[in-house]
C-alpha cells in the first residue's frame, strides 16, 4: 500500500460505487505525491472496523454507536474527523439527548417511576438508548427483557418500533407502536407532540426537537428540562442539562499509525472541491446510488478532531455510560444513592504514595488512580476512570471547560472552627527575585525565569497574562532567554533550565524537581532570575523550614518582591507588592459525584486535616514537607463553596477573563479538545 | 532514617503459600502506617497492602481473601501472608512505613516473589 493512500472502507455495493467515484475524483484534482483513496469493501460496519485494525483498511464514517464499538478493545480506534452540520461559521458536530417535561409539573429525574413517556423510537439514541441506559440501573428487576422491564417501570408509554402484542404498556400511548410518520407520536416530533399533548410526561429527545417544533419563544417557556443532578433548566440550557452530547457522524482511525494527518488532508482537500455547492460531476455529501453513502448527505463539511480527545472524551461519560449499560447489562450492588469509595488523581509517584497511605488510613473510603499530567488526571476524571482531585485556578478554569465542577476550596488563612464555612479572597500571585539583583518588573526581558507549570495560576496565567498585555505576542520564550516551565515543550528554551532527571526533564510533575511552587523557587535559588510563585512560598521555604539541603540554610531576607509599578519590597509585604490575587486551590469532581466527594472530604479532613498535631506518627492529609502532594501543604481545611459552585462563579470574572485572554498563547491539548 | 529489611521471598508453586516479613529498625514503625508494595518487570510498583497503627487494613482487589497484612509492634514488624499464590503474583515485594517516602524515595532492597510450576 503506498504510504499516502488512504484505504476507504465501503459497506455495501452504492458506497462502493461512490467510493470509486471518489477516488477517480480524487485523482484528478490532488497531485501526484498528495494523498490518494483506495477502496475497501465489507460486508457491514464492524467488518469494517476489524479491518481498520488489523491494517486492511485505513478509515470509516460511523454513527456514534458504531463510534463506541470500534473504541473498544480489541479494536482501540479513534476519532480523527467529524462531520459537521449547520453552517461554517457555527459548525455543529454534537446534537444533546434531552428529557422535555412541561414546566407545571414538579418531578425530577430521579421521580420518573410511575410517570408516562414519550420515545423517538425502539432502539433509537435520543429517544431510548440514552435515557434508558442511564435510568437502567433503576429499573425493576429482571432487567431482561429490557422492553418489559421499562414497561413496568413507566405507567404508560408510546415507543414506536416496539413489539405492542408482548409489550402493551410501550404502546399505550400511541395504540400499534407504528413505526412510520402514520403514527403521529413516530420520531422526534412525534415523540414531542405526544408530551405536548398532554399523553405522556416526559419526551426523550434531541435537544433541537422544541426549537423546530415551536417556534415561539413564549410557547417554548411552557417546557423545561430534566437535569441529571435533579435540577430542572429551560429549554436554552440544554448544553448544561442533558442526558448526553452525541457525536453525529465521525471518521475513525487506528490510535497508533492511524494516518490521521493524512486522512485529514484528504478530507479536507475533497471537500474544498466536492463539497456542499462545489462540484457538479461529483458531490461528497450526496449520491444518485442512495442516502448518506459513505458520509451523511445533511452534512456541510469536516472538522479535524483535535488530537488530544480519544474515543472516551469524545463520545462523553453520560454517552459511554448509557451504552455500557444497556450493553453489560451490569448494575453496582450498592443502592445507587449510597456514596461508592472515591477515586483520587494522583500525579506521578510522589503522590501515588501519599494517596496510597491515606487510602489504607481511610478504610478504602479513598482510592487512587494515577496519570503523569495533571490534564491527564482531569481526562480520567471526565471519563469516569476517577472521581476527583485539587487544583491550581488554571487548571480549575480547563477542568470546568471540560465540564467538571469546583467542590470544596483550599482554605489556607481561615483558622478553625470557621474555617470550613469561610470563603477566602485567595493567595497573591508574585514575583521572587534574589536581594543582591537589580531586577525590577520592567527590565525583565533576557532573564532566567523559573515557573510552577504552564497553566497553572501564580506560575504562568498571571504572569503571562501581564506580560502578553505588555508584549502583544506568544513567544515568551523569546522574551526570556532561559527558563524552566514545566509542561512547556521538550525543546523550548523555557525547558532549559529543568533539573529533571532526564526522561523526566520539563514534565509537570513532581519527577521534575523545579516543578510546582517549591519547585520554582529551587530554580531561582539555584539558577534562575525570577521566580513566580505564590506569597507563601519564600517564608515555607527559608529559614529552615525547609529540611532539604539545598534548602536548609536559606535566608527570607535575600529575596524580594517585584511590584508592578518597578519597585520593590520585602516579601513580608506581599499585600502592597504583588503581581494578582489568585483564586485558592480546589477540588473538582465530576457532577454526578460532586455530593459524594464533598461529604467524604469533610469526613476525611476531620480525621486527618489540620487538627492532627503529630504529623511523624499520623496520617496528615495537607503535609507532605513542603512537596504540596495532593493538596497545598498550608492548607488548613477544605470550605463549602455556597453558591460559588460553577467554575466561573469559582474563579471570579476578572480570572476567568485574564485565562480566556492567555487562550491565544495557550499549549493546552486538553482544553482545545474540551472546546471542540 | 529507617532501615527496612524485606525477607520470606522464594519459589513456590501455584496455590502455594509465603509468608513475608519486614522487619524496621527504630520504634518508629510501631506508630506508622505500613504498607507492602510489589513490583512485576515492566509494571508501575503497586500497593498490595496497608495497616494502620490501630490495626486497620486495606487490602488491594487482585489479593483480597488471599493475602493478611498484620504486624507485630513489639518485634517492629509487619507480615504479609500469601495464601493460595496465582503466577500473576510474582513480583519482587517491597514495605514501606511511609514516614519520609513522600519526598525521599527510599526503599528497600525487596523480596523476590516467584510464582511458577
Known amino acids: 500500500v503506498p504510504e499516502k493512500s488512504v484505504r476507504w472502507c465501503a459497506v455495501s455495493e452504492h458506497e462502493a460505487t461512490k467510493c470509486q467515484s471518489f477516488r477517480d475524483h480524487m485523482k484528478s484534482v490532488l497531485p501526484s505525491n498528495g494523498p490518494s483513496v483506495a477502496c475497501v469493501k465489507k460486508a457491514s460496519h464492524l467488518d469494517c472496523i476489524r479491518a481498520i485494525a488489523a491494517n486492511e483498511a485505513d478509515a470509516v464514517t460511523l454513527d456514534a454507536g458504531l463510534v463506541y464499538d470500534a473504541y473498544l478493545a480489541p479494536n482501540n480506534l479513534k476519532p480523527v474527523v467529524a462531520e459537521f452540520y449547520g453552517s461554517k461559521e457555527d459548525p455543529q458536530t454534537f446534537y444533546y439527548a434531552v428529557a422535555v417535561v412541561k414546566k407545571d409539573s414538579d418531578f425530577q429525574m430521579n421521580q420518573l417511576r410511575g410517570r408516562k413517556s414519550c420515545h423517538t423510537g425502539l432502539g433509537r439514541s435520543a429517544g431510548w438508548n440514552i435515557p434508558i441506559g442511564l435510568l437502567y440501573c433503576d429499573l425493576p428487576e429482571p432487567r431482561k427483557p429490557l422492553e418489559k422491564a421499562v414497561a413496568n417501570f413507566f405507567s404508560g408509554s408510546c415507543v414506536p418500533c416496539a413489539d405492542g402484542t408482548d409489550f402493551p404498556q410501550l404502546c399505550q400511548l400511541c395504540p400499534g407502536c407504528g413505526c412510520s410518520t402514520l403514527n403521529q407520536y413516530f420520531s422526534y416530533s412525534g415523540a414531542f407532540k405526544c408530551l405536548k399533548d398532554g399523553a405522556g410526561d416526559v419526551a426523550f429527545v434531541k435537544h433541537s426537537t422544541i426549537f423546530e417544533n415551536l417556534a415561539n419563544k413564549a410557547d417554548r417557556d411552557q417546557y423545561e428540562l430534566l437535569c441529571l443532578d435533579n435540577t430542572r433548566k429551560s429549554v436554552d440550557e440544554y448544553k448544561d442539562c442533558h442526558l448526553a452530547r452525541v457525536p453525529s457522524h465521525t471518521v475513525v482511525a487506528r490510535s497508533v499509525g492511524g494516518k490521521e494527518d493524512l486522512i485529514w488532508e484528504l478530507l479536507n482537500q475533497a471537500q474544498e472541491h466536492f463539497g456542499k455547492d462545489k462540484s457538479k460531476e461529483f458531490q461528497l455529501f450526496s449520491s444518485p446510488h442512495g442516502k448518506d453513502l459513505l458520509f451523511k448527505d445533511s452534512a456541510h463539511g469536516f472538522l479535524k478532531v483535535p488530537p488530544r480527545m480519544d474515543a472516551k472524551m469524545y463520545l462523553g461519560y453520560e454517552y459511554i455510560t448509557a451504552i455500557r449499560n444497556l450493553r453489560e447489562g451490569t448494575c453496582p450492588e450498592a443502592p445507587t444513592d449510597e456514596c461508592k469509595p472515591v477515586k483520587w488523581c494522583a500525579l506521578s509517584h510522589h503522590e501515588r504514595l501519599k494517596c496510597d497511605e491515606w487510602s489504607v488510613n481511610s478504610a478504602g473510603k479513598i482510592e487512587c488512580e494515577s496519570a503523569e499530567t495533571t490534564e491527564d488526571c482531569i481526562a480520567k476524571i471526565m471519563n469516569g476512570e476517577a472521581d476527583a482531585m485539587s487544583l491550581d485556578g488554571g487548571f480549575v478554569y480547563i477542568a470546568g471547560m471540560c465540564g467538571l465542577v469546583p467542590v470544596l476550596a483550599e482554605n489556607y488563612n481561615t483558622p478553625n472552627p470557621n474555617c470550613e464555612n469561610t470563603a477566602e479572597e485567595g493567595y497573591f500571585a508574585v514575583a521572587v527575585v534574589k536581594s543582591s539583583s537589580d531586577l525590577t518588573w520592567d527590565n525583565l526581558k533576557g532573564k532566567k525565569s523559573c515557573h510552577t507549570a504552564v497553566g497553572r495560576t501564580a506560575g504562568w496565567n498571571i504572569p503571562m497574562g501581564l506580560l502578553y498585555s505588555k508584549i502583544n505576542h506568544c513567544r515568551f520564550d523569546e522574551f526570556f532567554s532561559e527558563g524552566c516551565a514545566p509542561g512547556s515543550e521538550k525543546n523550548s528554551s523555557l525547558c532549559k533550565l529543568c533539573m529533571g532527571p532526564s526522561p523526566n526533564l520539563c514534565e509537570p510533575n513532581n519527577k521534575e524537581g523545579y516543578y510546582g511552587y517549591t519547585g520554582a523557587f529551587r530554580c531561582l535559588v539555584e539558577k534562575g532570575d525570577v521566580a513566580f510563585v505564590k506569597h507563601q512560598t519564600v517564608p515555607q521555604n527559608t529559614g529552615g523550614k525547609n529540611p532539604d539541603a539545598w534548602a536548609k540554610n536559606l535566608k527570607e531576607e535575600d529575596y524580594e518582591l517585584l511590584c508592578l509599578d518597578g519597585s520593590r519590597k520585602s516579601v513580608q509585604e506581599p499585600a502592597n507588592c504583588h503581581l494578582a490575587r489568585a483564586p485558592n486551590h480546589a477540588v473538582v469532581a465530576r457532577k454526578d459525584k460532586a455530593d459524594c466527594v464533598q461529604t467524604l472530604l469533610l469526613d476525611q479532613q476531620r480525621m486527618f486535616g489540620s487538627s492532627v498535631t503529630d504529623c511523624s506518627s499520623n496520617f496528615c492529609l495537607f503535609e507532605s514537607k513542603t512537596k504540596d502532594l495532593l493538596f497545598r501543604d498550608d492548607t488548613v481545611c477544605l470550605a463549602k463553596l455556597h453558591d460559588r459552585n460553577t467554575y466561573e462563579k469559582y474563579l471570579g470574572e476578572e480570572y476567568v477573563k485574564a485565562v480566556t485572554n492567555l487562550r491565544k498563547c495557550s499549549t493546552s491539548p486538553l482544553l482545545e479538545a474540551c472546546t471542540f | 532514617q529507617v532501615q527496612l529489611v524485606e525477607s520470606g521471598g522464594g519459589l513456590v508453586q501455584p496455590g502455594g503459600s509465603l509468608r513475608l516479613s519486614c522487619a524496621a529498625s527504630g520504634s518508629i514503625a510501631s506508630i506508622n502506617t505500613m504498607a507492602w508494595y510489589r513490583q512485576a518487570p515492566g509494571k508501575q510498583r503497586e500497593l498490595v497492602a496497608g495497616i494502620t497503627s490501630g490495626g486497620s487494613t486495606k487490602y488491594a482487589d487482585s489479593v483480597k481473601g488471599r493475602f493478611t497484612i498484620s504486624r507485630d509492634n513489639a518485634k517492629n514488624t509487619v507480615y504479609l501472608q500469601m495464601n493460595n499464590l496465582k503466577p500473576e503474583d510474582t513480583a519482587i515485594y517491597y514495605c514501606?512505613?511511609?514516614?519520609?517516602?513522600?519526598?525521599?524515595?527510599?526503599w528497600g532492597q525487596g523480596t523476590q516473589v516467584t510464582v511458577s510450576s
Open positions: 514501606t512505613d511511609y514516614s519520609k517516602r513522600y519526598y525521599q524515595d527510599y
